[in-house]
Interface confidence: medium
């Protein structure tokens, strides 16, 4: 590594990430007809202006609007699902309820799903050495700055009833610092969203509680309460079982409480 | 190099059946949209079929909907047409071509054809 | 389904000077800020062959005496100096919607 090259605290650009987009985007063309007409290379290019030559350390909003533009997607307001620390739960329960989207199933939250990427101030480099670290280097890094701006959009666009999964297993049920806490959560439009639905996700196959009496959650409810949004809460004490009766709601089994 | 080598085009009775062949060379074949064009003698181009990489999105011209099907087989980096219920007006030069990579609807690369004559 | 009307039919033009040929859409075929709209060139016997997409990008290995313009409904390729293995049938497409739709040809023959 050449010594000037700036050191940042997190892990470099995602191995073949330029291949990596470009083949995602044209599988999610393929995939969903109402977006087969998005053209690929152009979506990439502005995905690479959004950061190539740019302090890593300094991108906006403003830097993604060409690849929003791009990317533009209308998908059932009504049919939104948050998500916050528990994505792969969320994302096989949208695989399973395909009238339902989390942000990762619109072609931009499919593009970047678990990448990295960054760039270098003056060059035109991709740095696969390393990026910033949202903590220890800086907030306003490109892979910040692209979520916040892709789930506040995502948000914005949500209506009626929306739903979002939690984690009953962490300390913070709910966490302002999150995603969903920081960006989502005061996105939701009141004139357009009635409810706010929490999904609680346990953990433990013998966990009993009521996780929706969690202190977190009553400052979830509070803080939508007052942005005159309804709440409603819902413990799901076997995500296991709550799959498989989305799967086969005719089941038996399924008329019990999961 | 990139090749595309069409196959199984003949003389065939109105009403009859012919499944056309399209042998890929030279690219990734799993990573590509393909589509069938034809050519009617001395006529223009007319877009016939596509086909998706992985087979999930398929889409017809109206004038062969029911009447034909696009199919693909990665493993062997062919691509086929099969047409039933020929019709005179299906007659023409059909043409295998490869979808530009980045976007949907669009031939970067054509084979040389095969003539299918629909006649009594 | 868009038309595509191309204009003219024919073109006799003298080698070394300017071809040009309009392809006009029913209906545009913009859409996310770039035109859908591409130009091949067929030679007698053979398959056609991909000059220009979204209506300005010249593929690769093509000479850049050809160049393709406009947007919307209304587009043109231009042949800047024509050569004698130019002459060929040039056809538009444009992949806004489904169906593909082609144009009817221009020939181009030099005078």
């Known amino acids: 590594v050449p010594r000037w090259r700036q050191q940042w605290s997190g892990p470099g650009t995602t191995k073949r990430f330029p291949e990596t987009v470009l083949a995602r985007c044209v599988k999610y063309t393929e995939i969903h007809p109402e977006m087969r007409h998005v053209d690929c290379q152009s979506v990439w290019d502005a995905f690479k202006g959004a950061f190539i030559s740019k302090h890593p350390c300094n991108i906006t909003e403003e830097d993604y609007q060409p690849l929003m533009k791009l990317g533009t997607q209308t998908v059932p307001c009504n049919k939104i699902l948050l998500w916050s620390r528990i994505k792969d739960l969320a994302h096989q329960f949208t695989q399973v309820q395909r009238d339902m989207f989390t942000l990762e199933d619109t072609l931009l939250g499919y593009l970047a799903d678990d990448l990295t990427w960054c760039g270098e101030f003056n060059t035109s480099k991709i740095n696969y050495q390393s990026c910033p670290d949202w903590r220890k280097d800086c907030s306003n890094n490109p892979v910040s700055v692209f979520w916040k701006t892709v789930s506040r959009r995502f948000a914005e666009a949500a209506c009626d009833v929306v739903h979002v999964m939690l984690n009953g297993s962490r300390s913070k049920i709910f966490d302002k610092n999150s995603t969903f806490g920081s960006v989502e959560v005061h996105n939701l439009q009141p004139e357009k969203v009635q409810t706010l639905e929490a999904w609680v996700i346990h953990g433990g196959r013998e966990d009993s509680r009521d996780l929706c009496q969690d202190p977190t959650i009553k400052e979830l409810e509070s803080i939508i309460s007052k942005r005159n949004i309804q709440f409603s809460c819902k413990n799901i004490y076997r995500p296991d079982k709550f799959l498989q009766c989305v799967k086969n709601p005719e089941d038996s089994s399924c008329t019990s409480e999961i | 190099e990139v090749q595309l080598v069409e196959s199984g085009g003949g003389l065939v009775q109105p009403g009859g059946s012919l499944r056309l062949s399209c042998a890929a060379s030279g690219f990734t074949f799993s990573d590509y949209g393909m589509h069938w064009v034809r050519q009617a003698p001395g006529k223009g181009l007319e877009w016939v079929a596509f086909?998706?990489?992985?087979?999930?999105?398929?889409y017809y011209a109206d004038t062969v909907k029911g009447r034909f099907t696009i199919s693909r087989d990665n493993a062997k980096s062919s691509l086929y047409l099969q047409m039933t219920s020929l019709r005179a007006e299906d007659t023409a030069v059909y043409y295998c071509?490869?979808?530009?990579?980045?976007?949907?609807?669009?031939?970067?690369?054509w084979g040389q054809g095969t003539t299918v004559t629909v006649s009594s | 389904d868009i038309v595509m009307t191309q204009s003219p039919d024919s073109l006799a033009v003298s080698l070394g000077e300017r071809a040009t040929i309009n392809c006009r859409a029913s209906?545009?075929?913009?859409?996310?800020?770039?035109?859908?709209m591409h130009w091949y060139q067929q030679k007698p016997g053979q398959p056609p062959k991909l000059l220009i997409y979204r209506a300005s990008n010249l593929e690769s290995g093509i000479p850049d005496r050809f160049s393709g313009s406009g947007s919307r409904t209304d587009f043109t390729l231009t042949i800047s100096s024509l050569q004698a293995e130019d002459v060929a049938t040039y056809y538009c497409q444009q992949s806004n919607k489904d169906p593909l739709t082609f144009g009817g040809g221009t020939k181009v023959e030099i005078k």
């Open positions: 071509a490869r979808n530009y990579v980045s976007s949907y609807g669009y031939f970067d690369y």
């Open positions: 086909i998706s990489s992985g087979s999930s999105s398929i």
């Open positions: 209906e545009n075929v913009d859409n996310y800020g770039i035109s859908f």
